[in-house]
């Protein structure tokens, strides 16, 4: 069964800056990745970035830089200033659309009482939805 993992990290240098990393553990080819916050995409969450393996990458404030790390993982850096900046208990979700598995999504947030610049190693987060 495919799994999606999500890792959220607060940057030590900028305490209101976050890095989200997500990965897909499956054999299919990924056709689209959507990163959202505040809940799953389409269920109250707000899209931060969309990554397509051939068409490109789109991102919207407060997202600063979205990138493909490997063929099955992505990262997103969030700016930490302004009214729309994330806070420590913000939930971030990643949805991977793949063929032939379909869509798989998982969410994560900053580990409780984590030190800035530190985070737990990425582990598969609960799969919230498989379309």
């Amino acid at each position: 069964t495919p799994e999606v993992w999500v890792q959220v990290r607060m940057e030590a240098t900028e305490l209101s800056s976050f890095t989200i990393r997500c990965g897909f553990l499956g054999s299919g080819s990924i056709s689209l990745v959507t990163v959202s916050w505040g809940g799953p995409n389409g269920a109250g969450g707000t899209t931060l970035a969309v990554l397509h393996p051939e068409r490109g990458i789109r991102q919207w404030a407060p997202a600063r830089q979205a990138r493909w790390e490997t063929q099955s993982s992505i990262s997103l850096i969030l700016e930490g200033s302004g009214a729309s900046s994330p806070c420590a208990n913000t939930t971030f979700c990643c949805k991977f659309a793949s063929f032939p598995e379909g869509s798989w999504e998982a969410c994560g947030s900053l580990p409780p009482s984590s030190d800035p610049g530190l985070s737990a190693p990425p582990t598969p987060a609960p799969i919230l939805r498989a379309d």
Epitope: T46, T47, L48, V50, H52, P53, E54, R55, G56, I57, R58, W60, A61, R67, W68, E69, T70, Q71, S84
Partner: antibody, heavy 114, light 113 residues
């Protein structure tokens, strides 16, 4: 069928503002961001910026910051671009295009003239 | 900003001939994480909006005839029309789809003899 229907041509005076629209149909408006592109007469294309209808989040080409403002109205599935402090340099055809530029509106001609 | 340079600025060919046009970017458009080039090609006929032909440097958009082929990697890209048809009269633009802002080339105007 995906369609992007833009508002009609505009003749405006220097220093004025203009707001042009792009009404989307044939898909879920909030699922896809909208780009805006400028094409001056006989010239190439310039990306102005894009807006995420889901939350109104925007990304702008620095060149057009302060010149263009992108907004959306989810209830009518319409994207808007307002251009302000217009000069003759702003005379152009302006296009809306859905994310990845696979679907384009027909264009809106803006002419700035006294 | 990434600068996209196209050549030639115009060319005139007879129907049935093979055509190639070049696009060079000032920075690499290769996404190293997935080894894909984020470059697109568009066709714009007179009085019409641009039409997406190629994305990912070499993938044809749905419905685009297979006489259109994109190739290249990094900073050097080519659009080839294997057998030009009269309806291919247009200006062809390449676009940086790698990083903001999404810059376009100045275009190659294709005329049919």
């Amino acid at each position: 069928e995906v369609q992007l229907q833009q508002s009609g041509p505009e003749l405006v005076k220097p220093g004025a503002s203009v707001k042009i629209s792009c009404k989307a149909s044939g898909y879920t408006f909030t699922d896809y961001s909208m780009n805006w592109v400028k094409q001056s007469h006989g010239k190439s294309l310039e990306w102005i910026g894009d807006i995420n209808p889901d939350n109104g989040g925007t990304s702008y080409n620095q060149k057009f910051k302060g010149k263009a403002t992108l907004t959306v109205d989810q209830s009518s599935s319409t994207a808007y671009m307002e251009l302000r402090s217009l000069t003759s340099e702003d005379s152009a055809v302006y296009y809306c295009a859905r994310i990845w530029f696979a679907y384009w509106g027909q264009g809106t001609l803006v002419t700035v003239s006294a | 900003d990434i600068v996209m340079t196209q050549s030639p600025s115009s060319l005139s060919v007879s129907a049935g001939e093979k055509v190639t046009m070049s696009c060079k970017s000032s920075q690499s458009l290769l996404n190293s994480g997935i080894q894909k080039n984020f470059l697109a090609w568009y066709q714009q006929k007179p009085g019409q909006p641009p039409k997406l032909l190629i994305y990912g440097a070499s993938t044809r958009e749905s419905g685009v005839p297979d006489r259109f082929t994109g190739s290249g990697s990094g900073t050097d890209f080519t659009l080839t029309i294997s057998s030009v048809q009269a309806e291919d009269l247009a200006v062809y633009y390449c676009q940086n789809a790698h990083s903001y802002p999404f810059t376009f080339g100045s275009g190659t105007k294709l005329e049919i003899k």
